[in-house]
């Protein structure tokens, strides 16, 4: 750091003398001992030869000293007075200080009545004192004197001093307001110095600050502490700064220079637009958020977001900061889209660039229909299985499943359903069901039964009765029985062109009907299967019957 | 009663064809897929293909694609298995088999050897 | 391709015993799992399908349990005509079936 001053300091204390008496100055250095190095001593700024800490002068003019540790002291004005009144005043002194000023007469015991002035006013009670004590002194031009009377024999003559100028030296330097900055940018932190020096003779003073903009105090206003840290300027803080210095007993009091202080903002740059999730890939009821951030820019933000095809924005926020964020809750399909935010802090609004989002949509339920070549389908048939999701984001994967077993897969690849051919045989009867997949979940629909009829085959008719011919009073069973064909059934027998009757058979083994046999009886007997797909006529059968001759019936 | 009636032992020379049959009986040939299984000699099976009847549909199993033909005749509720360009490693036991997810019914099984 | 492996590979029993045979599939196949019987110089046969349904002929002291990846033929009180072979096939995947490697049951 820099040196302090050196010091000088009269010994007797007081700046004006009597020609030829001599004064002692003495140099001292706050921060060093008095033994260390040469002292350099000057007079009315020539360098005097002796290298003493203290010296004896008779000769009148500006002083001033040096030390190694040290830099040069104040002047100090010694006055050796030729006159036969002076006016002393005691050295140091320091603004703010109380005073003491003497009024000496060259011959002291026959001076009497002594009077003392200030810029040519008598101070009040200060008649025939020795000493008085003027209080609070500042660094003015005022101009002391003092008249007496001097004892001339037996006359009393009134003699005047020349006017004193008192030496008041300063006790602290006039301020000055340091700022970190003087065009700080908006955002940045400041701070704000009073910068000051107590003059290290009266290290014990003490100061306070404040500080000012425009005509507003800032802070907590007076503050032990010269510093003021400001976290962050804006552009409403430009202006004019000033600061003051006090010491605490409100006795001298000193304001700096005004320092203009201009906030710069900085334009917005780079403006960025992020999704998150990363990379804009949503599922329908996630939530969206939208980053807006600049690289650069200063002070208020004004930031808003947007959509294509959307006139409005989707909203808007204006903060201090690099970035903001809009959430959109629980995203819909609609949500889908190209997306841009926009950042401004200054005239025109700069736009990021476009980023795509899309929503996901997991599949719905899918529905399993079948589509055959009739409604009640039969061995041979070409079934087509299709599965179809009513709402799912391409591409869907369509699993196809009989009972539990996996048929196949069919793709959608932009969406709708998918198909898958059978062709059927017996043993595709059952549960059948499909699922939909999209990466978001897979979704199972509903079972849908089938039934594969097989149509009945040519059933064949036997004729059972209980001897190898049928006689009156026989009861005989007729026997039909399609060897293929889905159940139920129904069996119809015939005798001639007469209708016996009909069963239905729920089951393999055919129906029987009974008779019970009269000559009426003989003649052709058939039967008829059909489940509904198609009667089949058996083969005729003749049956004689005859009457008591077992000999003469015979079955053919 | 469902009974599949497989053709007899067969030897070829490497390099033949062979044609082997499977005779339906008890059952509506159309109504159910039949099945060809192959059997190496103290191993395991191994599923060749299906056919179905009706519309002459097949399936084969990627390993025989190109190795196995399956085709049926109707009329004589028949199914054939044709194997060409044979080696030594096609020597074993085939046999067909009815039905859709299972092998319900079994032929006796066709042996075939091949060997130069 | 699905794999199917039986365990063990071999398998000797005292006839009255029970024994409890394993298929383990490579992935999931739900139920769509059957078991057969070879004796020897025969045919194979469908004891079980659908992992437990037994056939219409077999022998009640067969069961078969399990679903997905693991599958268990347990015979109760093994009979002398029960030795021979028996395999494991599925079915999961249409028209694509797989057999297991087999399991060798012989008398102790």
């Known amino acids: 750091g820099v040196a302090p001053k050196a010091v000088l300091l009269l010994n007797p204390p007081w700046s004006t003398a009597f020609k030829g008496e001599k004064v002692a100055l003495i140099c001292s250095s706050i921060s060093h001992s008095l033994a260390q190095g040469d002292t350099y001593w000057y007079h009315d700024e020539k360098l005097l030869k002796i290298k003493h800490d203290k010296i004896q002068i008779t000769e009148p003019g500006n002083y001033q000293c040096k030390t190694r540790g040290s830099s040069l002291s104040d002047a100090v004005h010694v006055e050796f007075s030729p006159d036969w009144l002076i006016l002393q005043a005691l050295h140091p002194v320091f603004e703010g200080d109380n005073v003491i000023l003497r009024c000496q007469g060259k011959d002291n015991k026959n001076t009497h009545q002594k009077v003392y002035y200030k810029d040519g006013k008598q101070l009040p009670n200060s008649y025939n004192l020795e000493k008085i004590t003027v209080n609070s002194v500042s660094r003015d031009n005022s101009k002391y004197h003092c008249t007496a009377y001097r004892k001339f024999y037996i006359l009393d003559i009134e003699v005047t001093s020349k006017p004193l100028n008192i030496q008041v030296q300063e006790l602290f330097l006039h301020p000055v307001l340091r700022a970190s900055s003087s065009t700080p940018i908006e955002g940045s932190p400041m701070t704000l110095t009073c910068e000051t020096q107590l003059s290290p003779q009266r290290p014990d003073v003490q100061l306070q600050f404040s500080l000012f903009r425009d005509s507003q105090t800032l802070g907590l206003g007076w503050s032990r502490s010269p510093r003021l840290q400001i976290p962050a300027m804006w552009t409403e803080d430009s202006g004019s700064y000033w600061c003051e210095v006090e010491t605490v007993t409100h006795s001298i009091k000193k304001r700096s220079l005004r320092s203009q202080i201009r906030v710069q903002r900085v334009p917005v740059s780079n403006v960025n637009l992020e999704i998150r999730p990363t990379g804009g890939q949503l599922i329908e009821g996630e939530n969206m958020v939208l980053i807006c951030s600049v690289a650069q820019g200063s002070g208020t933000v004004t930031f808003s977001w947007h959509k294509e095809g959307r006139v409005r924005s989707l909203g808007r926020k204006t903060q201090r900061s690099l970035l903001a964020e809009l959430h959109v809750l629980t995203v819909k399909e609609s949500d889908a889209g190209r997306y841009y935010c926009a950042a401004d802090n200054v005239h025109s609004p700069i736009l990021s660039t476009w980023i795509r989002v899309t929503v996901r949509i997991p599949v719905s339920h899918p529905v399993l229909t079948f589509r055959a070549p009739r409604a009640h389908t039969v061995v041979g048939d070409l079934l087509e299985l299709h599965c179809e999701s009513l709402r799912g984001s391409p591409p869907i994967l369509y699993r196809f499943y009989h009972e539990d077993v996996t048929l196949g897969n069919s793709s959608a690849p932009s969406g709708g359903g998918a198909s898958f051919n059978l062709s059927l045989t017996a043993e595709h009867s059952g549960n059948y069901s499909c699922d939909a997949d999209n990466g978001l979940g897979a979704q199972h629909s509903h079972g849908v039964s089938l039934r594969v009829t097989v149509p009945v085959s040519r059933p064949v008719l036997t004729l059972r009765a209980p001897g190898a011919q049928a006689v009156v009073g026989d009861l005989l069973e007729l026997h039909c029985e399609s060897l293929r064909g889905s159940f139920p059934i129904l069996y119809w027998f015939y005798h001639e062109d007469d209708t016996l009757g009909n069963i239905s058979a729920h089951s393999g083994g055919g129906a029987s009907f009974n008779l019970s046999l009269t000559t009426e009886h003989s003649g052709n007997y058939s039967c008829e299967a059909d489940n509904g797909l198609g009667a089949q006529h058996s083969k005729v059968v003749t049956l004689n019957v005859t009457g008591t001759s077992r000999n003469r019936t015979g079955l053919t | 009663e469902v009974q599949l009636q497989q053709s007899g032992p067969e030897l070829w020379k490497p390099g033949a064809s062979v044609k082997m049959s499977c005779k339906a009986s008890?059952?509506?040939?159309?109504?159910?897929?039949m099945k060809w299984v192959k059997q190496s000699h103290g191993k395991s099976l191994e599923w060749i293909g299906d056919?179905?009847?009706?519309?002459?549909?097949?399936f084969y199993n990627q390993k025989f694609k190109g190795k196995a033909t399956l085709t049926v005749d109707k009329s004589t509720s028949t199914a054939y298995m044709e194997l060409n360009s044979l080696t030594t490693e096609d020597s074993a036991v085939y046999y067909c088999?009815?039905?859709?997810?299972?092998?319900?019914?079994w032929g006796q099984g066709t042996t075939l050897t091949v060997s130069s | 391709d699905i794999v199917l492996t039986q365990s063990p590979a071999n398998l000797s029993v005292i006839p009255g015993d029970s024994v409890s045979l394993s298929c383990r599939a490579s992935q999931n196949i739900r139920n769509n799992l059957h078991w057969y019987q070879q004796k020897s110089q025969e045919s194979p046969r469908l004891l079980i399908k659908?992992?437990?349904q037994s056939m219409s002929g077999t022998p009640s002291r067969f069961t078969g349990s399990g679903s997905g990846t693991d599958f268990t033929l347990t015979i109760n009180t093994v009979e002398t005509e029960d030795f021979g072979m028996y395999f494991c096939?599925?079915?999961?995947?249409?028209?694509?079936?797989?057999f297991g490697g087999g399991t060798k049951l012989e008398i102790k």
């Open positions: 659908f992992a437990s």
């Open positions: 088999a009815r039905g859709l997810y299972r092998f319900d019914y």
């Open positions: 096939q599925q079915s999961n995947n249409w028209p694509q079936y797989t």
């Open positions: 008890g059952y509506t040939f159309t109504d159910y897929y």
């Open positions: 056919i179905n009847p009706n519309n002459g549909e097949t």
